[in-house]
C-alpha cells in the first residue's frame, strides 16, 4: 500500500507512517514502528502537557512567584497548568496576569473614586471644593469639610483639598 501523506486526528506522520499522539498528561518516549505502538510516559510531579502531543519533555507548572505578588489560585495537574492570581491588596499588570503590583494609594488632596480589585487599580479623584483628604490611602474617599454652623461655631481657618476647616467660638458681642 501507498505510504500515507496525512494522518487521522490524534495521529502524526513519521517515517512514512501514522503514529498515535500521546494523550494530555503524557510525553513521547519513542515513535511507533511497523510493529510497535507509540510509547508514552506520564509527566512527572509539577509537570504537565495539556494537548495530544509528541513532545519529548513535559512543561514545568507555572511558578506563582510571591515576589511578584502572585499566589496559587488553582494547582496544576498532569494535564493542566497552575493558575496564578494576585495576593490580597495587589492587582494584575495585564489581562494575562503574569505579575501583580500593590494597589496605588490616593495622595492627600485626592480621594478614592473606585476601590481596586484583583484586575484593576485604585481610581483616584481630586477632592472638590468643600471636601478634603489629608491621608494617603487606597480606601478613603474625600471627606466633607466640617460644618461649623451646625455646631454653633464659626470658621476660623478655611479648609483646602488637604485640610478640614478649623472651627472656633463665635465672638460674643460685648454689652
Amino acid at each position: 500500500p501507498e505510504p500515507p501523506t496525512a494522518c487521522r486526528e490524534k495521529q502524526y506522520l513519521i517515517n512514512s507512517q501514522c503514529c498515535s499522539l500521546c494523550q494530555p498528561g503524557q510525553k513521547l518516549v519513542s515513535d511507533c514502528t511497523e510493529f510497535t505502538e507509540t510509547e508514552c510516559l506520564p509527566c512527572g510531579e509539577s509537570e504537565f502537557l495539556d494537548t495530544w502531543n509528541r513532545e519529548t519533555h513535559c512543561h514545568q507548572h507555572k511558578y506563582c512567584d510571591p515576589n511578584l505578588g502572585l499566589r496559587v489560585q488553582q494547582k496544576g495537574t498532569s494535564e493542566t497548568d497552575t493558575i496564578c492570581t494576585c495576593e490580597e491588596g495587589w492587582h494584575c499588570t495585564s489581562e494575562a496576569c503574569e505579575s501583580c503590583v500593590l494597589h496605588r494609594s490616593c495622595s492627600p488632596g485626592f480621594g478614592v473614586k473606585q476601590i481596586a480589585t484583583g484586575v484593576s487599580d485604585t481610581i483616584c479623584e481630586p477632592c472638590p471644593v468643600g471636601f478634603f483628604s489629608n491621608v494617603s490611602s487606597a480606601f478613603e474617599k474625600c471627606h466633607p469639610w466640617t460644618s461649623c454652623e451646625t455646631k454653633d461655631l464659626v470658621v476660623q481657618q478655611a479648609g483646602t483639598n488637604k485640610t478640614d476647616v478649623v472651627c472656633g467660638p463665635q465672638d460674643r458681642l460685648r454689652a
Epitope: N67, T93, S94, E98
Partner: antibody, heavy 113, light 108 residues
Framework: VKESEGGLFKPTDTLTLTCTVS????????VSWVRQAPGNGLEWIGG???????YYASWAKSRATITRDTNLKTVTLEMTSLTAADTATYFC??????????WGPGTLVTVSS | AFELTQTPSPVSAAVGGTVTIKCQAS??????LAWYQQKPGQPPKVLIV???NLASGVSSRFKGSGSGTEFTLSISDLECADGATYYC??????????FGGGTEVVVK
C-alpha cells in the same frame, strides 16, 4: 528562548524575527521583544501575553506586529520601514507585562544601504 | 509619555565600597519596578523585582527600595564582577513598560 538569525537589511525593508521557546507553553507565559542599539540602552518594543493579547511601546505601535504560534512554539516580530536607527541587537525574553527572568542571547540586525 | 530617568551615569567606587543608583518614574508605578545587570555581549540578568525583592540566586549585597515614583538600587561590598551597566524597568502596565537609560558602574 532563542532568536532567529538577524543580518543585513536595507532601509525601507521589513524585518521578521522569530523567537523559538522550549520548556514552557506559550499558553502559560508571554514573550516580549527588547532591542539595544550599539553602545546604547535597552528599549522595550512590545510583547504578547499568555492570553494572546499584544502590547507595544508607543513608538513601535505603527511599525511593529507581534504574533505567536502556540503549536510551533514561536513568537514573531515584524517591523516595517526600517531605517539605520533600527540597527540593534534584538532580544526575546519570557514574559508579557512583567519581569524578564529568561532572555535569549540576542541577534544583531544591521540596517544599511 | 511615561518615562524612567536613571541617575547618575557613570558612577565609580572602590572595591568594598557602596554605590547607589536612582530611578525616577514620571508617574506612580506603585512597586512595579525591576532592576537588571548587563555585562557587554550578554543579555540582562534580573536582580530585583517588586522594587525591593531579591530575584532568585542574587547576592544579598544588592538592595532595592522605594515605591511610587522614586526607586533606589544599592550595591554594597563592591566586587570587581559588579562592574556592569544597571537598568531599571517598570512593569506597572502596558502603557508604562519601559527601561531606564542605564547606569554604568565602574569598580576601581
Amino acid at each position: 528562548v532563542k532568536e532567529s538569525e538577524g543580518g543585513l537589511f536595507k532601509p525601507t525593508d521589513t524585518l521578521t524575527l522569530t523567537c523559538t521557546v522550549s520548556g514552557f507553553s506559550l499558553s502559560s507565559y508571554g514573550v516580549s521583544w527588547v532591542r539595544q542599539a550599539p553602545g546604547n540602552g535597552l528599549e522595550w518594543i512590545g510583547g504578547i501575553g499568555s492570553d494572546g493579547s499584544a502590547y507595544y511601546a508607543s513608538w513601535a505601535k505603527s511599525r511593529a506586529t507581534i504574533t505567536r504560534d502556540t503549536n510551533l512554539k514561536t513568537v514573531t516580530l515584524e517591523m516595517t520601514s526600517l531605517t539605520a536607527a533600527d540597527t540593534a541587537t534584538y532580544f526575546c525574553a519570557r514574559g508579557g507585562i512583567t519581569v524578564y527572568a529568561i532572555w535569549g542571547p540576542g541577534t544583531l540586525v544591521t540596517v544599511s544601504s | 509619555a511615561f518615562e524612567l530617568t536613571q541617575t547618575p551615569s557613570p558612577v565609580s567606587a572602590a572595591v568594598g565600597g557602596t554605590v547607589t543608583i536612582k530611578c525616577q518614574a514620571s508617574q506612580s508605578i506603585s512597586n512595579g519596578l525591576a532592576w537588571y545587570q548587563q555585562k557587554p555581549g550578554q543579555p540582562p540578568k534580573v536582580l530585583i523585582v517588586g522594587a525591593s525583592n531579591l530575584a532568585s540566586g542574587v547576592s544579598s549585597r544588592f538592595k532595592g527600595s522605594g515605591s511610587g515614583t522614586e526607586f533606589t538600587l544599592s550595591i554594597s561590598d563592591l566586587e570587581c564582577a559588579d562592574g556592569a551597566t544597571y537598568y531599571c524597568q517598570s512593569y506597572f502596565s502596558s502603557s508604562s513598560t519601559v527601561f531606564g537609560g542605564g547606569t554604568e558602574v565602574v569598580v576601581k
